[in-house]
Interface confidence: low
Amino acid sequence: SASSRRRQQSRNRSTQSQDVARVSSASDYNSSELKTACRKHELYVSFQDLGWQDWIIAPKGYAANYCDGECSFPLNAHMNATNHAIVQTLVHLMNPEYVPKPCCAPTKLNAISVLYFDDNSNVILKKYRNMVVRACGCH
Amino acid sequence: SASSRRRQQSRNRSTQSQDVARVSSASDYNSSELKTACRKHELYVSFQDLGWQDWIIAPKGYAANYCDGECSFPLNAHMNATNHAIVQTLVHLMNPEYVPKPCCAPTKLNAISVLYFDDNSNVILKKYRNMVVRACGCH
């Protein structure tokens, strides 16, 4: 019956209290493209390289990091995927030309404190929000 | 003097209270690739197309939407870029092989309510978080 079919489907699908069930994968790679899955990469940014060395006193640079990697089917638990990303992945699987894969983006960002010269050449200590990537996910 | 130089710079520059100043652009396109800038696109998702019609009673589908487009230099104000994305864009500008551009991802997500059958074939009304894209930005 339809009822028993639904129960069978329910047993087969993993449930989560808050999210649409994720399809898990043991692999950290998308085998078809051999590109690593979405993750945080280390990146040190020098303020001199950005041309900002004359107004930023300290630090000279900082560990900004960045996100990169595939958000391919199946999304694994490490990918911190939103419900929308899970839906989008399935839509992309069926219509790859129509809808892109979700993208690998920061899920946690931290601030850094910067010592700099203001408009009147006063030395100011200020916290700049969302400067450091702490975690990445599929969005 | 360095002090007067800084004052002169300050007269020429636009400042922002919370964020690293964004470089604005009137264009919604990255001229080199002719791809539109990061924005929200409309997308209706049918639960039948996803194969979920036997456990989701209502709705039959929903306006999920998705994000797509370029996060290229210069980032304009409509791109809701984080400070990190601004920094990453500049690093990519100087080292395109080393660091990717920021990606176009949801900045605002809404929930939807779904009526479905649980494991015991009970009818449940549940709110699923982060299902609908309301806004996109460069992250």
Partner: nanobody, 130 residues
Framework: EVQLVESGGGLVQAGGSLRLSCAAS????????MGWFRQAPGKERDFVAA????????YYTASVKGRFTVSRDNAKNTVYLQMNSLKPEDTAVYYC???????????????????????WGQGTQVTVSS
């Protein structure tokens, strides 16, 4: 007041080279950061390259890095853009611009900001044929 006059544009085949020059009038040339921008038909004006007051710092957009070289001669009040390995997509009007930015100035008014530049030349056409 600074006046800028570009020269050196023209028609060149893909893979070829051109050297653009920008001559500045006035004795304050060395107090300006100099930039090159370009505008293709029907498109916005885009940043290409910039050089600091002293010539010690140079900046490039990703699509030209490794192919174009920006430099300046403060004794001659001239800034140059050496363009090698030209591609059809480099076709545009190229503008020279002068602005009072430092190599270490703030985001929003540094080498990449069009608003940073106070003075602009009339432009020189570069056409790259395939």
């Amino acid at each position: 007041e600074v006046q800028l006059v570009e020269s050196g544009g023209g028609l060149v085949q893909a893979g070829g080279s051109l050297r653009l020059s920008c001559a500045a009038s006035g004795r304050t040339f060395s107090s300006y950061g100099m930039g090159w921008f370009r505008q293709a038909p029907g498109k916005e004006r885009d940043f290409v390259a910039a050089v600091s007051k002293s010539g010690g710092s140079t900046y490039y957009t990703a699509s030209v890095k490794g192919r174009f070289t920006v430099s300046r001669d403060n004794a001659k009040n001239t800034v140059y853009l050496q363009m090698n390995s030209l591609k059809p997509e480099d076709t545009a009007v190229y503008y020279c611009a002068a602005g009072r930015w430092e190599s270490g100035s703030r985001p929003g008014s540094t080498w990449y900001g069009e608003r940073t530049y106070d003075y602009w030349g009339q432009g020189t056409q570069v056409t790259v044929s395939s």
